[in-house]
Interface confidence: medium
């Protein structure tokens, strides 16, 4: 991260401050999309009253974007031409290439629970028969 971005008010992992992690993350699961197209990556945290202080979107070990409670959205410079914030706390990937195939993680940093992580696997297909996985919007 050779640039200034909002602070990640969270840690990662399980539980915090002596609290029990009651929340669950619902994701779009395994999805596929066509090369050149776009896809929405979406996660939703439920069943917890913990304060969400930041959501990080990562591809393997690369930061794609963050949405910080204090500072709003920041898209990583290396992805700014192909990544759009939203809808909600989700992320839209555009101009997909086969190299975009892989695991994506939404990381919800919360207090006092700690960090909740959701996993999405995206397959970018050459053919035009790609079937998009189920999608949902954050209310």
């Amino acid at each position: 991260y050779p640039y200034d971005v909002p602070d990640y008010a969270g840690g990662g992992g399980s539980g915090g401050g002596g609290s029990m992690m009651t929340g669950t993350i619902e994701t779009t699961g395994n999805i596929s999309a066509e090369k050149g197209g776009s896809i929405i990556l979406q996660c939703h945290l439920s069943s917890t009253t913990a304060q969400v202080t930041q959501v990080n979107w990562e591809q393997q070990d690369q930061a794609l974007a963050i949405c910080n409670a204090d500072l709003g959205w920041h898209i990583s410079p290396s992805f700014k031409d192909r990544v759009a914030p939203g809808p909600g706390l989700g992320l839209t990937l555009q101009s997909l290439t086969v190299n975009d195939t892989g695991e994506y993680f939404c990381i919800y940093h919360t207090y006092p629970d700690g960090t909740y992580t959701g996993r999405i696997f995206l397959e970018v297909l050459e053919s035009s028969v790609a079937e998009h996985g189920a999608r949902f919007q954050i209310p």
């Epitope: 008010a9 204090d70 500072l71």
Partner: antibody, heavy 119, light 107 residues
Framework: EVQLVESGGGLVQPGGSLRLSCAAS????????MHWVRQAPGKGLEWVAF????????YYADTVKGRFTISRDNAKNSLYLQMNSLRAEDTAVYYC????????????WGQGTMVTVSS | DIQMTQSPSSLSASVGDRVTITCRAS??????LAWYQQKPGKAPKLLIY???TLQSGVPSRFSGSGSGTDFTLTISSLQPEDFATYYC?????????FGGGTKVEIK
């Protein structure tokens, strides 16, 4: 170059108060969460308090909760720790530290300021 | 709170030695562990975060591994400037806690 410079330490009697300051330079202070960490003489490190970039998230160690207050002034690139009802066990070097961009690890630290609580 | 236990508390080694320090968490912290180096009278310096990611500017002879509860810091070939005290810190959850430290001394 990132620089963090603490000040405000000194000798104070038990029950007294002290206000520590941390002057930040070399980075966009308003974009980073900040920590205070202390180290008693000859002992290990103890996390004290955290404040997020816009002050919306503030957390304290149980040992200082209700006595210490962390705050920041982004316009002045400054971090503060107001310490009240000081006890002998608060004697330590107090460091301000910048939170890494992505996790609660601390990537830059000041040189520390010594706080001695003694009668 | 999560307790972090480091071992050994001190060790003696020679320049060129391979040194291993371990850190154990009282419960799972996923991969979220940092390692710091501190020299006498100086502030700590971040070496490793998220278990195995090397902080920018830190020599590659330092490496971290582990997940869950057991973690290791390895110095592949000890250099004169590496004699210091090393601390682990869990950055998994509030409150963030440190290990007691491991002092690496010259044999």
């Amino acid at each position: 170059e990132v620089q963090l410079v603490e000040s405000g330490g000194g000798l104070v009697q038990p029950g007294g108060s002290l206000r520590l300051s941390c002057a930040a330079s070399g980075f966009t202070f308003s974009n980073f969460g900040m920590h205070w960490v202390r180290q008693a003489p000859g002992k290990g490190l103890e996390w004290v308090a955290f404040i997020s970039s816009g002050s919306s998230s503030i957390y304290y160690a149980d040992t200082v909760k209700g006595r210490f207050t962390i705050s920041r002034d982004n316009a002045k690139n400054s971090l503060y720790l107001q310490m009240n009802s000081l006890r002998a066990e608060d004697t330590a070097v107090y460091y301000c530290a910048r939170m890494r961009l992505d996790y609660y690890a601390m990537d830059y630290w000041g040189q520390g300021t010594m706080v001695t609580v003694s009668s | 709170d999560i307790q972090m236990t480091q071992s050994p508390s001190s060790l003696s080694a020679s320049v060129g030695d391979r040194v291993t320090i371990t850190c154990r968490a009282s419960k799972s912290i996923s991969k979220y562990l940092a390692w710091y180096q501190q020299k006498p009278g100086k502030a700590p310096k971040l070496l490793i975060y998220s278990g195995s990611t090397l902080q920018s500017g830190v020599p590659s002879r330092f490496s971290g591994s582990g997940s869950g509860t057991d973690f290791t810091l390895t110095i592949s070939s000890l250099q004169p400037e590496d004699f210091a005290t090393y601390y682990c810190q869990q950055h998994n959850e509030y409150p963030w806690t440190f290990g007691g430290g491991t002092k690496v001394e010259i044999k």
